[in-house]
């Protein structure tokens, strides 16, 4: 039961996480105008990975896409790449984990296969979460660097009364969404990996059962063991499994890594 719960929870947590990574990647508010020096601005700027926007006090918002690839900062390109890799890995992980879920039976798929799939999806979720966290952190670092640089040069023109105030940017909502989503995906992946251990049949246990079978053939029938671990494919074994001779958690339980597409 615990293995199934761990696998299911891992899947759900990862699903939410990947949904968050996708949302963060698409959001426009990666960086928002710092209003410390002008809290009553009539023009508010914010930027995403794909476009920058200006929201006027009048209510009108204008967004412009970054229509160049070569003209963009390398760091921004790197962040885009990390987020996309995270989404792709997460999506694949989700697909794999769906088939790995213990509660879903596909043909006569063995538990060892499900265990492998669960582990694969778990690793994918972990890497996906790390990519998202890395991407958001790189962007945040870029913002902090630029923030202090622009603070140092706050007033670029001081001709008499004329002041040219440089616009500074601070953390936008997407960064927090990305960090949380990456963390959730990572946690979901770890849960899947933990569940994988519960799903995978251990050789030592199997040998021990075989050894005892000579003395207690009725109680430790190999077929019965197979049924409990999901290895047996005959109807008798399946019936034992379906009848609940063992709890589902004992049989197989794996946290999956693909939670959100």
């Amino acid at each position: 039961m615990a293995v199934t719960a761990c696998q299911g929870l891992g899947f759900v947590v990862s699903l939410i996480g990947i949904a968050g990574i996708i949302a963060a990647t698409c959001m426009d508010q990666w960086s928002t105008q710092d209003l410390y020096n002008n809290p009553v601005t009539a023009v508010f700027n914010y930027q995403g990975l794909w476009r920058s926007c200006v929201r006027e006090s009048s209510g009108f918002t204008e967004c412009r896409g970054y229509f160049t690839l070569l003209g963009l900062p390398a760091m921004l390109q790197a962040v885009r790449a990390l987020m996309i890799v995270g989404i792709v890995l997460g999506a694949i992980g989700l697909l794999v984990s769906i088939f790995a879920l213990k509660c879903i039976r596909i043909g006569s798929m063995e538990d060892s296969a499900k265990a492998n799939m669960t582990l694969t999806s778990g690793i994918m979720f972990i890497v996906s979460g790390l990519c998202a966290i890395a991407g958001v952190s790189v962007f945040a670092n870029m913002l902090v660097t630029n923030f202090w640089m622009s603070t140092a040069n706050m007033y670029t023109g001081m001709g008499g009364m004329v002041q040219t105030v440089q616009t500074r940017y601070t953390f936008g909502a997407a960064l927090f969404v990305g960090w949380v989503a990456g963390g959730l995906t990572l946690i979901g992946g770890v849960m899947m990996c933990i569940a994988c251990r519960g799903l995978a049949p251990e050789e030592t246990n199997y040998k021990a059962v075989s050894y005892h079978a000579s003395g207690h053939s009725v109680a430790y029938k190999p077929g019965g063991f197979k049924a409990s671990t999901g290895f047996g494919s005959n109807t008798k074994n399946k019936k034992i499994y379906d009848g609940g001779a063992r709890t589902e958690d004992e049989v197989q339980s794996y946290p999956s890594k693909h939670d959100y597409v």
């Epitope: 009553v40 601005t41 023009v43 200006v54 006090s57 009048s58 040219t164 105030v165 616009t167």
Partner: antibody, heavy 118, light 113 residues
Framework: EVQLVESGGGSVKPGGSRKLSCAAS????????MHWVRQAPEKGLEWVAY????????YYTDTVKGRFTISRDNAKNTLFLQMTGLRSEDTAMYYC???????????WGQGTSVTVSS | DIVMTQSPSSLTVTAGEKVTMSCKSS????????????LTWYQQKPGQPPKLLLY???TRESGVPDRFTGSGSGTDFTLTISSVQAEDLTVYYC?????????FGAGTKLELK
């Protein structure tokens, strides 16, 4: 046709109160931020107050802060300016204006005159 | 607060001539996010409310004759009337649309020579 019609002006003693109204028609009132701008006799324009379309943001010029309150009733397509503690320097023609793209005031009412004198 | 300074305060012109008036702000009105200048020009005839002429420093409001053109960036702006007509002889105001309070210039009055 967009129309803004102010009302509520008149003579008032110093320290007195007055509530100005601006009836809007010809456009979806609830989609636009609105402003009050005033013009003292033979003087230039002075921005007074702003209210966002959903009544969640307000701005006032320093000279009227704490004395004037801008509000709106989107159901009745009406903008208000509650003026209290009136002073002689508040004597002016008060215009309501619609806020649009570029943070510009594209439509203005004909104005309502407020005179503060003893 | 951003201070708007218009010059000259009055200008004597003859019909058909080209007229230029200036507006300076104490702080840049250029928004880095969209590279637009948040400066607005209005025309006000006696006994009437102001009329919007240009926003974003140079974008003409619909219905405004093309003889009115705006230029400038940052802190220095200009309104040009290529060929002044009789109906243009009135007062022009520039306004900061970048930051609250939305301050206006004192105005430039066009008068017939």
């Amino acid at each position: 046709e967009v129309q803004l019609v102010e009302s509520g002006g008149g003579s008032v003693k110093p320290g007195g109160s007055r509530k100005l109204s601006c009836a809007a028609s010809g456009f979806t009132f609830s989609d636009y931020g609105m402003h009050w701008v005033r013009q003292a006799p033979e003087k230039g324009l002075e921005w007074v107050a702003y209210i966002s379309s959903g009544s969640n943001t307000f701005y006032y010029t320093d000279t009227v802060k704490g004395r004037f309150t801008i509000s709106r009733d989107n159901a009745k397509n009406t903008l208000f300016l509650q003026m209290t503690g009136l002073r002689s320097e508040d004597t002016a023609m008060y215009y309501c204006a619609r806020f649009t793209r570029g943070n510009a005031l594209d439509y203005w009412g004909q104005g309502t005159s407020v005179t503060v004198s003893s | 607060d951003i201070v708007m300074t218009q010059s000259p305060s009055s200008l004597t012109v003859t019909a058909g001539e080209k007229v230029t008036m200036s507006c300076k702000s104490s702080q840049s009105l250029l928004n880095s996010g969209n590279q637009k200048n948040y400066l607005t020009w209005y025309q006000q005839k006696p006994g009437q409310p102001p009329k919007l002429l240009l926003y974003w420093a140079s974008t003409r409001e619909s219905g405004v004759p093309d003889r009115f053109t705006g230029s400038g960036s940052g802190t220095d702006f200009t309104l040009t009337i290529s060929s002044v007509q009789a109906e243009d002889l009135t007062v022009y105001y520039c306004q900061n649309a970048y930051s609250y309070p939305l301050t206006f210039g004192a105005g430039t009055k066009l008068e017939l020579k």
